[in-house]
């Protein structure tokens, strides 16, 4: 692989745990310039595997509120609007990064944390286990 | 209100941009102790709104690899295994936090960034607009 030279303007870290502890600019840059986050707002109702959104709140974490999807049914909604139990509603999960103050109550010291969140649900064909 | 005292073990920041720039411990704590991330690994094939996963790689970002979902069809797979265009496959999107090296190529200096990622797809009833 190509070795990219270290930028001479990089800040130095005197921290004894370096490089585990790094400097982070908290002024968030938003890359989603052409996106409209509202566009998927009603999928949870219109989906054949609809879901409810539950509030997961922790003031010591950033973001403090995370909305978690919980599938409404075990099965999926068919063309007649009924639940078809030959199909399964399953959560689509994703690991996301969050910030947590560490040590607690320190204004300028944080730790990255990885948490698994359910973003929505999808309808899948079940895996059928045949008993011999 | 009660004033919570600052933890005496808090690190100091000598950075000229402080307090926008803070110390973050990258030794990531994983809260997903009881979860099995593999359990949703085949949903992209079994879903009635199947998707392909595309590798989005950027060495200047953490995490450097993000998997992006792209729905395979405009419609959804019906019981016969055919695409039903009376239904729509749509991406479920979520905004996530990532770290970007800033200045570029610096090993210990980052900026928070927010990006929109497609996590998977779900099958929805279309919104029909009637023309007068």
């Amino acid at each position: 692989g190509i070795t990219i030279p270290r930028n001479p303007g990089c800040p130095n870290s005197e921290d004894k745990n370096f490089p585990r502890t790094v400097m982070v600019n908290l002024n968030i840059h938003n890359r989603n310039t052409n996106t409209n986050p509202k566009r998927s707002s009603d999928y949870y109702n219109r989906s054949t595997s609809p879901w409810n959104l539950h509030r997961n709140e922790d003031p010591e974490r950033y973001p403090s509120v995370i909305w978690e999807a919980k599938c409404r049914h075990l099965g999926c909604i068919n063309a007649d609007g009924n639940v078809d139990y030959h199909m399964n509603s399953v959560p689509i999960q994703q690991e996301i990064l969050v910030l947590r103050r560490e040590p607690p109550h320190c204004p300028n010291s944080f730790r990255l944390e990885k948490i698994l969140v359910s973003v929505g649900c999808t309808c899948v064909t079940p895996i059928v286990h045949h008993v011999a | 209100g009660i004033t919570i005292p600052r933890n005496p073990g808090c690190p100091n920041s000598e950075d000229k941009n402080f307090p926008r720039t803070v110390m973050v411990n990258l030794n990531i704590h994983n809260r997903n102790t009881n979860t099995n991330p593999k359990r949703s690994s085949d949903y992209y094939n079994r879903s009635t709104s199947p998707w392909n996963l595309h590798r989005n790689e950027d060495p200047e970002r953490y995490p450097s690899v993000i998997w992006e979902a792209k729905c395979r069809h405009l419609g959804c797979i019906n019981a016969d295994g055919n695409v039903d265009y009376h239904m729509n496959s749509v991406p479920i999107q979520q905004e996530i936090l990532v770290l970007r090296r800033e200045p570029p190529h610096c090993p210990n200096s980052f900026r928070l960034e927010k990006i929109l990622v497609s996590v998977g797809c779900t099958c929805v009833t279309p919104i029909v607009h009637h023309v007068a």
Partner: antibody, heavy 124, light 109 residues
Framework: QVQLQQSGPGLVKPSQTLSLTCAIS??????????WGWIRQSPSRGLEWLGR?????????DYAVSVKSRITINPDTSKNQFSLQLNSVTPEDTAVYYC??????????????WGQGTLVTVSS | EIVLTQSPATLSLSPGERATLSCRAS???????LAWYQQKPGQAPRLLIY???NRATGIPARFSGSGSGTDFTLTISSLEPEDFAVYYC??????????FGQGTKVEIK
């Protein structure tokens, strides 16, 4: 362009119910990226957040502890508006009442659109 | 509940001067959930800054915000005649904890 238009009486008698309505144009009360709140302002209390409603597959109501036992905020999806009801009012509830849109994007929270304000006087 | 204390209560300055307004929280708040508003007599508050340092749409570059933890600052680099008003900071810690500071009045000297 999002706008909020407030309506309701400016005079309420002690022990009665204060009722205000906020009509939304340019956005939806059922939006999943916003919450809709009420804030009041008086010389004695300054700006005081009273509560909010937000829709995320169901309606969520959050109320300030100071008024929790007396307040109700309701949506009216058919008219795209929301209302405030504050029961058992006293002269201490005299204030300018504002409705506002709270941007609620998970990563930020702030009030970007405000109603024009309604001065409500509690007096017999 | 988190108390936001703004200082000074009144700031007397001339047009063209730099204004520095302080907002101190009784506990740590996430900078991402800290906002600043401007209010003129007879008007509703107007959003200036969100996320401690992001200017709202249409807000001139002379307004800037900074801070983290418990200490936040709003700076107006060079006061214009229309900037004389009352300024409020506001924090969101949780869905039930949302508070405003008592305000700083910037008046013409």
């Amino acid at each position: 362009q999002v706008q909020l238009q407030q309506s309701g009486p400016g005079l309420v008698k002690p022990s009665q119910t204060l009722s205000l309505t906020c009509a939304i144009s340019g956005d939806s009360v059922s939006s999943s990226s916003a919450a809709w709140g009420w804030i009041r302002q008086s010389p004695s209390r300054g700006l005081e957040w009273l509560g909010r409603i937000s829709y995320r597959s169901k309606w969520y109501n959050d109320y300030a502890v100071s008024v929790k036992s007396r307040i109700t905020i309701n949506p009216d999806t058919s008219k795209n508006q929301f209302s405030l009801q504050l029961n058992s009012v006293t002269p201490e509830d005299t204030a300018v009442y504002y409705c506002a849109r709270e941007v609620d994007s998970m990563y930020y929270s702030y009030f970007d659109i405000w109603g024009q304000g309604t001065l409500v006087t509690v007096s017999s | 509940e988190i108390v936001l204390t703004q200082s000074p209560a009144t700031l007397s300055l001339s047009p063209g001067e730099r204004a520095t307004l302080s907002c101190r929280a009784s506990q740590n708040v996430w900078a991402f959930y800290l906002a600043w508003y401007q209010q003129k007599p007879g008007q509703a508050p107007r959003l200036l800054i969100y996320g401690a340092s992001n200017r709202a749409t249409g807000i001139p570059a002379r307004f800037s915000g900074s801070g983290s933890g418990t200490d936040f600052t709003l700076t107006i680099s060079s006061l214009e005649p229309e900037d004389f008003a009352v300024y409020y900071c506001q924090q969101y810690r949780s869905t039930l904890s949302l508070t405003f500071g008592q305000g700083t009045k910037v008046e013409i000297k």
